[in-house]
């Protein structure tokens, strides 16, 4: 049994880091493998992660961490029984993938303005709470070409757009994702999408 593709890990910079790797053949990850992880600091405690299958030869492990700070560095040991298959390290702050925003809501009752709001996925005491910026994706269910991205570079988790920038009388969907420049993170996954029917009063034509 050998590791074909070494583990790569990303952290949500809160409580979970996810590591993925591939074996050289079909593997029952949960029964055959264990991923041990431990902070490098003196007398830090070792933890065991039981991996799950992620395709025939792929494995994924969700490392639970009570919290994460920029100084943290973990040693990682991948074991198959008594055999050490791979040894590496992982610094969560250098491999951050933020959590996806939640509770995306479209408020359509504000005159001819659409107000989109969502929730910051981090608690206020987390470093990323005040460092997230967002991208909002709005698209038409009827017209695949009607697809747009709005970059939200301010901290408030909301976006206002004129309803008239979208077509009236058709359904739209929206979703939002986040990233943090401070840790040069990757983008989060998209939030679940929300749907609304766009309708607004056309202004009277001037004659």
């Amino acid at each position: 049994m050998k590791v074909l593709q070494e583990p790569t890990c990303v952290s949500d910079y809160m409580s979970i880091s996810t590591c993925e790797w591939k074996m050289n053949g079909p593997t029952n990850c949960s029964t055959e493998l264990r991923l041990l992880y431990q902070l490098v600091f003196l007398l830090s405690e070792a933890h065991t992660c039981i991996p799950e299958n992620n395709g025939g030869a792929g494995c994924v492990c969700h490392l639970l961490m009570d919290d994460v700070v920029s100084a943290d560095n973990y040693t990682l040991d991948l074991w198959a029984g008594q055999q050490l298959l791979w040894k590496g390290s992982f610094k969560p702050s250098e491999h951050v993938k933020p959590r996806a925003p939640g509770n995306l809501t479209v408020h359509t009752n504000v005159s001819d303005t659409l107000l989109l709001t969502w929730s910051n996925p981090y608690p206020p005491d987390n470093y990323l709470y005040n460092h997230l910026t967002y991208a909002v994706n709005i698209w038409s269910e009827n017209d695949p070409a009607d697809f747009r991205i709005y970059n939200v570079t301010y901290l408030e988790p909301s976006l206002r757009i004129a309803a008239s920038t979208l077509k009236s009388g058709i359904s739209y969907r929206a979703r939002v994702r986040a990233w943090a420049q401070c840790y040069n993170t990757t983008w989060s996954e998209w939030s679940p999408s929300t749907k609304w029917h766009n309708s607004y009063r056309e202004p009277f034509e001037q004659h």
Epitope: F41, L42, S44, E45, N73
Partner: antibody, heavy 118, light 111 residues
Framework: EVQLVESGGGLVRPKGSLKLSCAAS????????MNWVRQAPGKGLEWIVW??????????YYADSVKDRFTISRDDSESMLYLQMNNLKTEDTAMYYC?????????WGQGTSVTVSS | DIVLTQSPASLAVSLGQRATISCRAS??????????MHWYQQKPGQPPKLLIY???NLQSGVPARFSGSGSGTDFTLNIHPVEEEDAATYYC?????????FGGGTKLEIK
């Protein structure tokens, strides 16, 4: 919210025994190393004992000043830390703190007072 | 055992000024890119509170006027600007090896 609440302190005669308890809540107790640190009246801080988690077979380390007299133990199912103190001496008079360790001693209980006097 | 020597034993600093506390270790407490030195604040009748871990990292919830620096054997805790509520005793502590020892403490008085 992390909380550590010590109990069991009191007045005891020299050569007597006492058992201190620490109730932990607000965190995954079973994954942390835990300490007892004491502070004699008007003095500085003295680390006395450390216990690691199950993943390290509950390894223990004692300061020379308490070795062979004090015993640390833990009950992960109840999130409890204990310190059994035997053959107490007057110099053991102190406030005893239960302390969590991660990168440093990051959370401390309010302490329980032990007085050894005849 | 590693002996930690704090200086001064006490100091008085005017409100808004800088307080500097030193901690010297009898041997290096740095290894593998980390300095295993931590700083605590203790007010009368209260348990110690972690301020700085691993020499320079601010513990969550601690005001940014506290900062730590140093490596090897020499470490410093700075408080600037000092506020009334900073009156306390400050301890350094290492976790480089067993036993983890504490400095003797520095009592800070606000003038």
């Amino acid at each position: 919210e992390v909380q550590l609440v010590e109990s069991g302190g009191g007045l005891v005669r020299p050569k007597g025994s006492l058992k201190l308890s620490c109730a932990a809540s607000g965190f995954s107790f079973n994954t942390y190393a835990m300490n007892w640190v004491r502070q004699a009246p008007g003095k500085g801080l003295e680390w006395i004992v450390w216990i690691r988690s199950k993943s390290h077979n509950y390894a223990t380390y004692y300061a020379d000043s308490v070795k062979d007299r004090f015993t640390i133990s833990r009950d992960d199912s109840e999130s409890m830390l204990y310190l059994q103190m035997n053959n107490l001496k007057t110099e053991d008079t102190a406030m005893y703190y239960c302390v969590r360790h991660l990168r440093a001693m990051d959370y401390w209980g309010q302490g329980t007072s032990v007085t050894v006097s005849s | 055992d590693i002996v930690l020597t704090q200086s001064p034993a006490s100091l008085a600093v005017s409100l808004g000024q800088r307080a500097t506390i030193s901690c010297r270790a009898s041997k290096s407490v740095s290894a593998s890119g980390y300095s295993y030195m931590h700083w605590y604040q203790q007010k009368p009748g209260q348990p110690p509170k972690l301020l700085i871990y691993l020499a320079s990292n601010l513990q969550s919830g601690v005001p940014a006027r506290f900062s730590g620096s140093g490596s090897g054997t020499d470490f410093t805790l700075n408080i600037h600007p000092v506020e009334e509520e900073d009156a306390a005793t400050y301890y350094c502590q290492h976790s480089r090896e067993l036993p983890p020892t504490f400095g003797g403490g520095t009592k800070l008085e606000i003038k």
